[in-house]
Amino acid sequence: AWELTILHTNDVHSRLEQTSEDSSKCVNASRCMGGVARLFTKVQQIRRAEPNVLLLDAGDQYQGTIWFTVYKGAEVAHFMNALRYDAMALGNHEFDNGVEGLIEPLLKEAKFPILSANIKAKGPLASQISGLYLPYKVLPVGDEVVGIVGYTSKETPFLSNPGTNLVFEDEITALQPEVDKLKTLNVNKIIALGHSGFEMDKLIAQKVRGVDVVVGGHSNTFLYTGNPPSKEVPAGKYPFIVTSDDGRKVPVVQAYAFGKYLGYLKIEFDERGNVISSHGNPILLNSSIPEDPSIKADINKWRIKLDNYSTQELGKTIVYLDGSSQSCRFRECNMGNLICDAMINNNLRHTDEMFWNHVSMCILNGGGIRSPIDERNNGTITWENLAAVLPFGGTFDLVQLKGSTLKKAFEHSVHRYGQSTGEFLQVGGIHVVYDLSRKPGDRVVKLDVLCTKCRVPSYDPLKMDEVYKVILPNFLANGGDGFQMIKDELLRHDSGDQDINVVSTYISKMKVIYPAVEGRIKFSTGSH
């Protein structure tokens, strides 16, 4: 028998420095977690003590904090090189700055293979990107070889900016021939490493013949066997075992997100490359693990540029700004209210005596809110804090939509409610009531909007044929998170100001903020 240790990360989202337990900015160092310096200590400890070790990343290193805002991916290449990653799969966020923003800082600088079998380049891009990412890579590990085959969510064109010259194929259809190719090369131990979410990971384990292990990402899935060590609730045991269509037991793993855990999976193979056993657990990277001094020194060196950029106080909050996915993807959250209020405030234009303002409404996808802000840091809010909340470098845009389109958008907001998906809308200038006992597409039972053509603003029922102005993220205007109806039906689209700047300006203007949850979004009795 031959034993392989797979160490894996996914959805690190620019958390190069240690963070608080909820993956926002580290406030009390003695209770902070993760970060590449701490990760390196653990990785080096395991590499020293165990014989056959691979360090893999399942995508979405890009995007999430000021590190990415400032360094744009150069930091990912540098520190992943320093940690000596063995391979990485492309995630959807690796395309957030377009293909060029992937090629120059990361693909050209990485000293490890970057993989995706289901992304096919065409047109002029094909020759430019050739060889910079691969469908698979065969890695020597001890006296054996291991094949790593990559995959990326086929939803990436809806989630990011890969442009028109990359085709995202169905994962299973694309993976099978690559795995078959590896088999013909006499590679009998194959890991599928990718970024399509836990449901697809399980499907790949079930459907792709020859895949021995699936290491995934995208859905921030936390798996654990036994008593979990922190706040995350396991979605299943680690590893999650899928019985493949050809009768094999295939371990599937994922390691939550934000570098809080290091996935640790031990696989035992027989001489024919069959998995005999698999066991392990994510390792919580808490403060009992010291930060590596060499990596930490490098982090501090790179930090200097960020400090100049980001550490000035913009204003104060006297309340917790709840930007957690557990809140903002399920119900009204005060972080959503704050951002929408800032968006409206940024668009105050008193150009007509008939109107108190030209726009009163804001919608914001809950999935775009990426971090909370703790008020217990003296209430201080910095650009850096906001960059963790709104890491995508988007803009808040002005669109004109018919009432019927807005109604469709709100139906879409809850069409698959409860799965922690990003399309759940936070709002401003809108009162919505949902009845989740009704079938998807018919769950909006009340939708009132704040009048604009009035001296005393009040809420009136939405009129299907009326044209409304709405402030929203450019992501939504472009049909992101499945809001195709907005993209297809908008009557006018004017691009606006940078998202973080809108919120920072508002906080600076207000000086002290205390946004509340105030009944903008309600669920009718008995259904929530």
Epitope: Q45, P293, A297
Partner: antibody
């Protein structure tokens, strides 16, 4: 975590030195790296080698031809064997456990004299 | 092998005095350095790890500093209990190597 060295206090030149380290309060297969370190009469310290929780072994190249570190997981013990000893191997021998590269846990040491 | 040169090899200091012991590596060891205190007939005890981090249970009068090739251990106010021999260890590269030791005695 407690470590206790044991073995003969006197070894003849050209013979083999064999020492045992018994670990209590921690399984030697769960984690940590288990080291042998010696201290010569002039107080100079020398790292000799380790065996990890998974059985990986690393030796100081200066001793590589003479040293062997093994373990008995059922007894939670690890062992040092040093062959072809000379009077230069007279020292206090320590076993030590380390989690993150520095030696956090030490035995009390056992003195070995090489003499005919 | 990386050589660790410790100085002084012995020293006398008064109670309450600030004491500094230095360790120089023959190459950059990137702060992979720990400090140990050994009292007569006892085994060494970790004081500092990763050059600057105080080990659990170690009094705060002990501190470590340095980077690259040059490191130091400081006792801010010497106490009688600090009579011992102090060693540095580099664990950045195998084989791990110790400094020659500094014997500290009370004046």
């Amino acid at each position: 975590v407690q470590l206790q060295e044991s073995g003969p206090g006197l070894v003849k030149p050209s013979q083999s030195l064999s020492l045992t380290c018994t670990v209590t309060g921690h399984s030697i297969t769960s984690d940590y790296v288990w080291n042998w370190i010696r201290q010569f009469p002039g107080n100079k310290l020398e790292w000799m080698g380790y065996i990890s929780y998974s059985g990986i072994i690393k030796y100081n190249p200066s001793l590589k031809s003479r040293i062997s570190i093994t373990r008995d997981t059922s007894k939670n013990q690890f062992f040092l064997q040093l062959n072809s000893v000379t009077t230069e191997d007279t020292a206090t021998y320590y076993c030590a456990g380390d989690e993150y590269f520095w030696f956090a846990y030490w035995g009390q040491g056992t003195t070995v004299t090489v003499s005919s | 092998d990386i050589q660790m040169t410790q100085s002084p090899s012995s020293m006398y200091a008064s109670l309450g005095e600030r004491v500094t012991i230095t360790c120089k590596a023959s190459q950059d060891i990137k702060s992979y350095l720990s400090w140990y205190q050994q009292k007569p007939w006892k085994s060494p005890k970790t004081l500092i790890y990763y050059a600057t981090n105080l080990a659990d249970g170690v009094p705060s009068r002990f501190s470590g500093s340095g980077s690259g090739q040059d490191y130091s251990l400081t006792i801010s106010s010497l106490e009688s209990d600090d009579t011992a021999t102090y060693y540095c260890l580099q664990h950045g590269e195998s084989p791990y190597t110790f400094g020659g030791g500094t014997k500290l005695e009370i004046k």
